[in-house]
Interface confidence: medium
């Protein structure tokens, strides 16, 4: 069937439309287009004869139409008047006629809209605002946007006038937003520029900050006032009802008790004409005296003396507080407070009790701190340490030994070689040493204040050749899967290579084996029973190489899950039951048996002669290793048939 399709159906003014013909019959003589829904010679637009390919304009031809051989009609520069129906009249070669009608609609291109408002400065909770989208356009749809979102549902929002007018009733400050309107028709959509609604509000009740109302004499009073308001509020301050100044901040330096009173902030909005006030009551307290600490012993001796610290001055009905190292007092049997907390006593002082100590006096407003006090605890000397730790030196080098002992006041040092006093210095230096410098080197540390003295003796051997090394261990009986063991090759010597062997082989690569301290220390992490091997260390320098005697690691393990033998579980009445329990364990475990949950004997072997069906049941072997603290067990069912 002959049909007409309009492309597009909705046409913008000034654009073009194609009336496209479908299912055109064959053997045609020609065809004509007409404006309207019927064939009317007065409204013919154009005719076309196929044989001559001749197009003939009709009375309704505007010069904007083009006809194509396939009968389609193109209309250019569309005007509003072009809206409507178009009829195609087809004349076939047999002079039989056929007709088809199509249509399209013409719409104007919309201009960019704008928003007009009936109130540019509405007052909150009082005014309404009506926004109107301009211009008014026929056949246009109107839409509204708030902050680029579609209109929220609200009883205070109302659309009217074909959605062209948006009314906000009883505006609030939250209506301060970006408003846009949009016009749409079938051929265009345009959005207006934003209009920001400027809602006048406030002032709200002002807030005075800071919130604290108690001050100390001598401080500065700095109050700030703020009230939500549009336009911003104008502020005034009143003290005890008397006007002070028209500023947002009130500043009074170096206040006294006389500055106590009621402080009022008034906020005024000149546009809304509203005023709001807030009152705060300020109390100024007199300055209490700054506390200080007195001590009954300025130089106490460690582990001998007690010290009593007292917080001065004594004030009636006052709370005294104490701090040590900027922390509240720790719980300790060596710390005692008097009933009024004014005196803190340290019993048997230690070097860790130096402090600093602070006391505080609490008043209505705050806590006043004393200056910190540090105790001068006399201690030591501890056993001196001689460094470096080498015991072997090669001839020709310089020997430089340093001695240090923890002590207050610092220790005085003396050096002795083979019992003979050398010098009173902390360091001993001997250049170009020989074998004759081998001997016992003693460092003596003396504390003149406590009168105590301590010594450390170090054997030094001067030899190019190293001695036979030995292995020291930090754990002689490590527990499997729990402990680590550190072997150290002794002695420590300069310019020495340290080597290790396990069972006569060089060290295997293992994440559980770690060398440190210049290879002098071998650490086994998370030992296993397989680590129970012979460990040998070697030392090597330019002229010697020696190995230690082997040290066998005794790894404690188990007990593993025990095994009961023989494996049989069925016996004949009258037979002897002889069960043996074994569990891998180091040291050997303790064994015990239970039959049907009842404890029996503490032996590895359970023997019952001439068993009967009464001996049916569960036989449990329990193993425990006292060294590892671990236990294990296994249960076996025994059946005795008559």
């Amino acid at each position: 069937k002959l049909t007409i399709e309009s492309t597009p159906f909705n046409v913008a003014e000034g654009k073009e439309v194609l009336l496209l013909v479908h299912n055109l019959p064959q053997h045609l003589f020609g065809y004509s287009w007409y404006k309207g829904e019927r064939v009317d010679g007065n409204r013919q637009i154009i005719g076309y004869v196929i044989g001559t390919q001749q197009a003939t304009p009709g009375p309704a031809y505007s010069g904007r139409e083009i006809i194509y051989p396939n009968a389609s009609l193109l209309i250019q520069n569309i005007i509003q008047n072009d809206t409507g129906f178009y009829t195609l009249h087809v004349i076939k070669s047999d002079l039989v006629n056929e007709e088809a009608t199509g249509q399209f609609r013409v719409y104007p291109e919309l201009p960019k809209p704008s928003i007009s408002s009936n109130n540019s400065k509405p007052v909150e909770d009082k005014d309404a605002v009506a926004f109107t989208c301009e211009p008014e356009t026929q056949d246009a749809t109107y839409l509204w946007w708030v902050n680029n979102q579609s209109l929220p549902v609200s009883p205070r929002l109302q659309l009217s006038n074909g959605n062209r007018t948006l009314t906000l009733f009883n505006v609030t400050r939250n209506d301060t937003a970006s408003y846009k309107c949009e016009t749409q028709n079938p051929v265009s959509a345009r959005r207006s520029d934003s209009v920001i609604l400027n809602v006048l509000y406030g002032p709200d009740a002002p807030t005075i900050s800071p919130l604290n109302t108690s001050y100390r004499s001598g401080e500065n009073l700095n109050l700030s006032c703020h009230a939500a308001s549009n336009p911003p509020a104008q502020y005034s301050w009143f003290v005890n009802g008397t006007f002070q100044q028209s500023t947002q901040e009130l500043f009074i330096p170096n206040i006294t008790v006389n500055n106590s009173g009621s402080y009022t902030c008034q906020a005024h909005n000149s546009d809304t004409g509203l005023n709001r006030t807030t009152v705060t009551t300020i109390t100024v307290y007199a300055e209490p005296p700054k506390p200080f600490i007195t001590s009954n012993n300025s130089n106490p001796v460690e582990d001998e003396d007690a010290v009593a610290l007292t917080c001065e001055p004594e004030i009636q009905n006052t709370t005294y507080l104490w701090w040590v190292n900027n922390q509240s007092l720790p719980v300790s049997p060596r710390l005692q407070l008097s009933n009024d907390n004014r005196t803190l006593t340290l019993l048997s002082v230690t070097r860790n009790d130096v402090g600093p100590y602070e006391c505080g006096i609490q008043n209505e407003l705050s806590v006043d701190h004393s200056d910190p006090v540090i105790l001068n605890v006399l201690y030591g000397p501890d056993d001196p340490t001689i460094s470096p730790s080498y015991t072997y030196y090669r001839p020709g080098v310089n020997l430089s030994l340093s001695c240090h002992a923890a002590s207050n006041p610092p220790a005085q040092y003396s050096w002795l070689i083979d019992g003979n006093i050398q010098q009173h210095t902390q360091e001993l230096f001997i250049s170009n040493i020989t074998e004759k410098n081998s001997g016992l080197y003693t460092c003596q540390a003396n504390n003149s204040a406590s009168g105590h003295s301590r010594t450390t003796v170090k054997t030094i051997t001067v030899s190019a050749e190293l001695p036979k090394p030995s292995i020291s261990s930090n754990n002689s009986k490590p527990v499997e899967d729990k402990d680590a063991v550190a072997f150290t090759c002794e002695p420590e010597a300069q310019n020495t290579t340290y080597l290790w062997w396990v069972n006569g082989q060089s060290l295997p690569v293992s994440p559980r084996l770690q060398l440190s301290n210049g290879n002098r220390t071998l650490t086994l992490f998370n030992v296993t029973r397989n680590d129970a091997r012979a460990y040998v260390c070697g030392i090597q320098n330019s002229v010697s190489a020696n190995r230690s005697d082997p040290v066998t690691l005794d790894v404690l393990y188990g007990p593993d899950t025990p095994i009961i033998s023989p494996p049989d579980s069925s016996y004949l009445s009258g037979a002897n039951l002889n069960l043996s329990c074994h569990s891998a364990s180091n040291p050997s475990p303790q064994y015990s048996w239970r039959i049907n949950g009842i404890p029996q004997q503490h032996t590895q072997v359970l023997f019952i002669a001439k068993i009967t069906p009464n001996n049916n049941g569960t036989y449990a072997c329990f193993v425990s290793n006292l060294a590892t603290g671990r236990n294990n067990s296994i249960v076996k069912s025994i059946t005795v048939s008559a």
Epitope: P395, T434, E435, A464, P467, K468, Q505, V543, A545, N546
Partner: antibody, heavy 120, light 106 residues
Framework: QVQLQQSGAELVKSGGSVKLSCTAS????????MHWVRQGPEQGLEWIGH????????EYAPKFQGKATFTTDTSSNTAYLQLSSLTSEDTAVYYC?????????????WGQGTTVTVSS | ENVLTQSPAIVSASPGEKVTITCSAS?????MHWFQQKPGTSPKLVIY???NLASGVPARFSGSGSGTSYSLTISRMEAEDAATYYC?????????FGAGTKLELK
């Protein structure tokens, strides 16, 4: 296995100098020290000194200070002994010697010796 | 330097006989080492660090001593033991050898 291969015999004129080599196989010379020892005809052993091939540190017996110079070439695993201002007193067999603990034993390795003859 | 004096200079022993060679140091040393040398060959370590048997050395060899006095003992002489034996100290520089003791088979 470990071996120390020394260079061949040398006949040197009095006042001249000579450079002897000792090439190690089976171990890296940087991991040990190389000592040099000499033995005069029908005489005992004399320690000349040693070198640490890793850093070139040397130690000489006072008698050989200025007479002997030790060097190494770690890329070829070779130690060298240079002798200068030679006299008939320096006629001897020169040995290189390396000692190291391996496993539970201490091994002491010697080269086969290089005979140096100083002629007038 | 530390001078090592070996004695005797020459010793003859029959197979199965016990042989002792001594080495005296002019200054105390921490250990002594002993070498064996046969004609036309390089020295070979037999005892290290006073009393330790070097690899491949028969158990009939032993060493002892301390301070300035050390000795090497062969419990039962065998023909293959005929050689010159040197002591060596490594406690101080320069390292020194003894003049040697020639052990002959009787």
């Amino acid at each position: 296995q470990v071996q120390l291969q020394q260079s061949g015999a040398e006949l040197v004129k009095s006042g001249g100098s000579v450079k002897l080599s000792c090439t190690a196989s089976g171990f890296n010379i940087k991991d040990s020290y190389m000592h040099w020892v000499r033995q005069g005809p029908e005489q005992g052993l004399e320690w000349i000194g040693h070198i640490d091939p890793e850093n070139g540190d040397t130690e000489y017996a006072p008698k050989f200070q200025g007479k002997a110079t030790f060097t190494t070439d770690t890329s070829s695993n070779t130690a060298y002994l240079q002798l200068s201002s030679l006299t008939s007193e320096d006629t001897a067999v020169y040995y290189c010697n390396e000692g190291t603990p391996t496993g539970p034993y201490y091994f002491d390795y010697w080269g086969q010796g290089t005979t140096v003859t100083v002629s007038s | 330097e530390n001078v090592l004096t070996q004695s005797p200079a020459i010793v003859s022993a029959s197979p199965g006989e016990k042989v002792t060679i001594t080495c005296s140091a002019s200054s105390s040393v921490s250990a002594m080492h002993w070498f064996q040398q046969k004609p036309g060959t390089s020295p070979k370590l037999v005892i290290y660090s006073t009393s330790n048997l070097a690899s491949g050395v028969p158990a009939r060899f032993s060493g002892s001593g301390s301070g300035t006095s050390y000795s090497l003992t062969i419990s039962r002489m065998e023909a293959e033991d005929a050689a010159t034996y040197y002591c060596q100290q490594r406690s101080s520089y320069p390292l020194t050898f003894g003049a040697g003791t020639k052990l002959e088979l009787k």
